[in-house]
Interface confidence: low
Amino acid sequence: MDGSGEQLGSGGPTSSEQIMKTGAFLLQGFIQDRAGRMAGETPELTLEQPPQDASTKKLSECLRRIGDELDSNMELQRMIADVDTDSPREVFFRVAADMFADGNFNWGRVVALFYFASKLVLKALCTKVPELIRTIMGWTLDFLRERLLVWIQDQGGWEGLLSYFGTPTWQ
């Protein structure tokens, strides 16, 4: 058997591997963008940069725009403010599960999950726990794989995000 490089290959936009890979790129970019704007230049956030193709760039810009809108979502802000960073793993998965507890999936909630992760990262930076950053990314993508992957596949992959939110006029 071969495959000593990156494991198990990848396929089209709806393959598990491609969705997770794009999700990882988008999440990292989203967190770096938001944390960078809030906390200024943070060396802890200087993770390796994935190459961005035109499609991923569009998706990143779409996420950035929605993230800005979520800043004014009071319900989400309250939920995030209540997070106890003493046991962040348990809290993360509980809040993430609560977001989808009713069994209804939509792109808004997927983005809210990313937004929640970025807020946790900011909390981690503020409380001098930079090692939590990669960990929080791992949790978010674990949750995405366990609970959201099949749904994202059913939407035709990440491209469905663009059609759901529409392409902003300034693009």
């Epitope: 000593s4 990156e6 494991q7 997770m20 790129f25 990669r134 960990t135 990314m137 674990d142 366990e146």
Partner: antibody
């Protein structure tokens, strides 16, 4: 060529300890999740523990939690399983296996799938 | 923890037969399911990952599918070298469980 070689198995008395090693070659262990899986004589496969060296995450089956410790020394490209308070029911062939590759902050969606396995090392717990 | 109930525990088949093995998850899981083949005295070999993706180097007669909480491994035309024990495996939040195994024997 990817290779995993286990060592450290043997006969031990109940309540005793053993440390298993899994020497990896052909890839950088830092960027893969690693797993230990055991198989009691004539029985099926049982997952024991996993580690993601990049994060330092460790995970354990309930049956070994508190008794076994998984670790990795990335400078030696080796994973370990420290087994304490051994019981007769821990008797098995212990395999180490490689899981998913790490990229951009994430162990890939195939991280649970074990694509390379060692030859196994037999641990016998008996008085 | 999520349990994987594998059936049948054993089956007898002839070369050329179509063979189907099923694993049922005790609760809803993602497609984080893999299938392995093991021969006596040997380490398991990965056949299928992500429920339906064929691992490199594995013959195309092996395929995997998913329907709800049921995961199926199909061997379209059994070959002499396919007589072995097959295991399914799932991961939920990095906790892994294997099915009990299915022994495929010569009829």
């Amino acid at each position: 060529e990817v290779q995993l070689v286990e060592s450290g198995g043997g006969l031990v008395q109940p309540g005793g300890s053993l440390r298993l090693s899994c020497a990896a070659s052909g890839f950088n262990l830092s960027y893969y999740s690693m797993h230990w899986v055991r198989q009691a004589p004539g029985k099926g496969l049982e997952w024991v523990a996993s580690i993601s060296p990049y994060y330092g995450y460790t995970y354990y089956a309930d049956s070994v939690k508190g008794r076994f410790t998984i670790s990795a020394d990335t400078s030696k490209n080796t994973a370990y399983l420290q087994m304490n308070s051994l019981r007769a029911e821990d008797t098995a062939v212990y395999y180490c296996a490689r899981g998913g590759a790490y990229y951009f902050g994430y162990y890939g969606s195939g991280s649970y799938a074990m694509d390379y396995w060692g030859q196994g090392t037999l641990v016998t717990v008996s008085s | 923890d999520i349990q994987m109930t594998q059936s049948p525990s054993s089956l007898s088949a002839s070369v050329g037969d179509r063979v189907t093995i099923t694993c049922r998850a005790s609760q809803s899981v993602s497609s984080a399911v893999a299938w392995y083949q093991q021969k006596p005295g040997k380490a398991p070999k990965l056949l299928i990952y992500s429920a339906s993706s064929l691992y490199s180097g594995v013959p195309s007669r092996f395929s995997g599918s998913r329907s709800g909480t049921d995961f199926t491994l199909t061997i379209s035309s059994l070959q002499p070298e396919d007589f072995a024990t097959y295991y399914c495996q799932q991961s939920s939040y990095s906790l892994i469980t294997f099915g009990q195994g299915t022994k495929v024997e010569i009829k």
